[in-house]
Amino acid sequence: QNCSGPCRCPAEQAPRCPAGVSLVLDGCGCCRVCAKQLGELCTERDPCDPHKGLFCDFGSPANRKIGVCTAKDGAPCIFGGTVYRSGESFQSSCKYQCTCLDGAVGCMPLCSMDVRLPSPDCPFPRRVKLPGKCCEEWVCDEPKDQTVVGPALAAYRLEDTFGPDPTMIRANCLVQTTEWSACSKTCGMGISTRVTNDNASCRLEKQSRLCMVRPCEADLEENIKKGKKCIRTPKISKPIKFELSGCTSVKTYRAKFCGVCTDGRCCTPHRTTTLPVEFKCPDGEVMKKNMMFIKTCACHYNCPGDNDIFESLYYRKMYGDMA
């Protein structure tokens, strides 16, 4: 992790890096490694991609162990093949308003993420994509075998969608905070980011937090009850310690994780909060990192890898984060 020891490189020559990822010398000048990309965790040995103007942001001078690859101030963003200047806002699609900040893109949904519970007036609510409409809208399917005339038999009317208003005015500053992005890893420790100007100087800044949607080693499908297709929030039997690049959380946590489905849906965090976690490293150094903690998960068909990148990143995501 640090450069105090002798150089030890893997036996095979140089690693094969994915397209667009630079092959660079590690921070110790020892071995050739695939450079870490924007938003990934970095260390002294695992440097960020210098050809993309990235540097390892350790967050505070006290913490020199693990950082996040960050673009230098003013770095542009490449998004969907278009280059945007830092500070520039754009609409990635009719559903998302995005902002570029120092190489990172943060987006806010323009469509309502509202839910609808069944009622006599709308016994089988569904969100559907309608031709010519950007946002999904609620329709109320009627019961097939109903003969009684009443609220449950009403002809459905589609929703006039009101997007959530994520802004507020404060002392001549229009405060805007994007949603937390989806966790960069579907299992294990990853990074989630957002862009905000909710600070004393009203300047846009990037914030990041560690996140773990589920542990990689958990075989969650085994726990799905007979006749069910999903396990939304599996019970974690024992408290765990988080691990981060060789460092271990000081406290144990009875954390919640998201489950899995067997019918093609994916389960993602829905309501989360952000709390500081202290990690202790083998050399005794202690560092504090903000981390996402899951309150509730949602299982849905808008899975990462679907056509709309932000649909998969933000659908029912990070609802009502407290931090």
Epitope: R116, L117, S119, D121, C122, P151, D160, F162
Partner: antibody, heavy 114, light 110 residues
Framework: EVQLQESGPGLVKPSQTLSLTCTVS????????VHWIRQHPGKGLEWIGV???????DYNAAFMSRVTISKDTSKNQVSLKLSSVTAADTAVYYC????????WGQGTTVTVSS | ETVVTQEPSLTVSPGGTVTLTCRSS?????????ANWVQQKPGQAFRGLIG???NRAPWTPARFSGSLLGGKAALTLSGVQPEDEAEYYC?????????FGGGTKLTVLG
């Protein structure tokens, strides 16, 4: 963000008509129904009635002869009118969204007194 | 007049399991009653937890589950937390109107 806000006079004279308005934001009242509920001091909840998304209404039989719920979709507002009030109508009045009564207003206190 | 009855009060220890029930005076509760469960914590607004018998609102933790048990609507809390201390009301639909239960005051010990 879904919000419901009740408003109206806090004091109504006996035999007069109590008029309250529920102003809604974050959803459309042409998509969701809105319920009126009241709570007497230290007591449980009493359902008054509902206006459904299509404009139909249903009322608690106890209020049937003197209650009217209507809506103005252009303003996203629902109103409650309760006529011939007595001291027994003194309560906190709430509006709530249909669908699990998921979102509620903070409530408005109405006192019936001369 | 239809009456909906709930336990006036229940007490549970943290980590324990408790079931709140909602009985109809005119027979068994069914899915056609669209049983709803509403929570009010001290000093806070009401909010719906469960709608349509068993559907959780997005903010409702997984430890809350709605079901039909022995002809009654039931709200089960597993692994009760101190913050679950609140007043819980059920509401049942009867073709043309809703009726609320009297409410259950849930106390979480210690």
């Amino acid at each position: 963000e879904v919000q419901l806000q009740e408003s109206g006079p806090g004091l109504v004279k006996p035999s007069q008509t109590l008029s309250l308005t529920c102003t809604v934001s974050g959803f459309s009242i042409s998509t969701f129904g809105v319920h009126w509920i009241r709570q007497h001091p230290g007591k449980g909840l009493e359902w008054i009635g509902v206006i459904w998304r299509r404009g139909g209404t249903d009322y608690n039989a106890a209020f049937m002869s003197r209650v009217t719920i209507s809506k103005d979709t252009s303003k996203n507002q629902v109103s409650l009118k309760l006529s011939s009030v007595t001291a027994a109508d003194t309560a906190v009045y709430y509006c709530a969204r249909d669908g699990g009564f998921d979102y509620w207003g903070q409530g408005t206190t109405v006192t019936v007194s001369s | 007049e239809t009456v909906v009855t709930q336990e006036p009060s229940l007490t549970v220890s943290p980590g324990g399991t408790v079931t709140l029930t909602c009985r109809s005076s005119i027979g068994a509760v069914t899915t056609s009653n669209y049983a709803n469960w509403v929570q009010q914590k001290p000093g806070q607004a009401f909010r719906g937890l469960i709608g349509g018998t068993s559907n959780r609102a997005p903010w409702t933790p997984a430890r809350f589950s709605g079901s039909l048990l022995g002809g009654k609507a039931a709200l089960t809390l597993s692994g009760v937390q101190p913050e679950d201390e609140a007043e819980y009301y059920c509401a049942l639909w009867y073709s043309t109107h809703y009726v609320f239960g009297g409410g259950t005051k849930l106390t979480v010990l210690g």
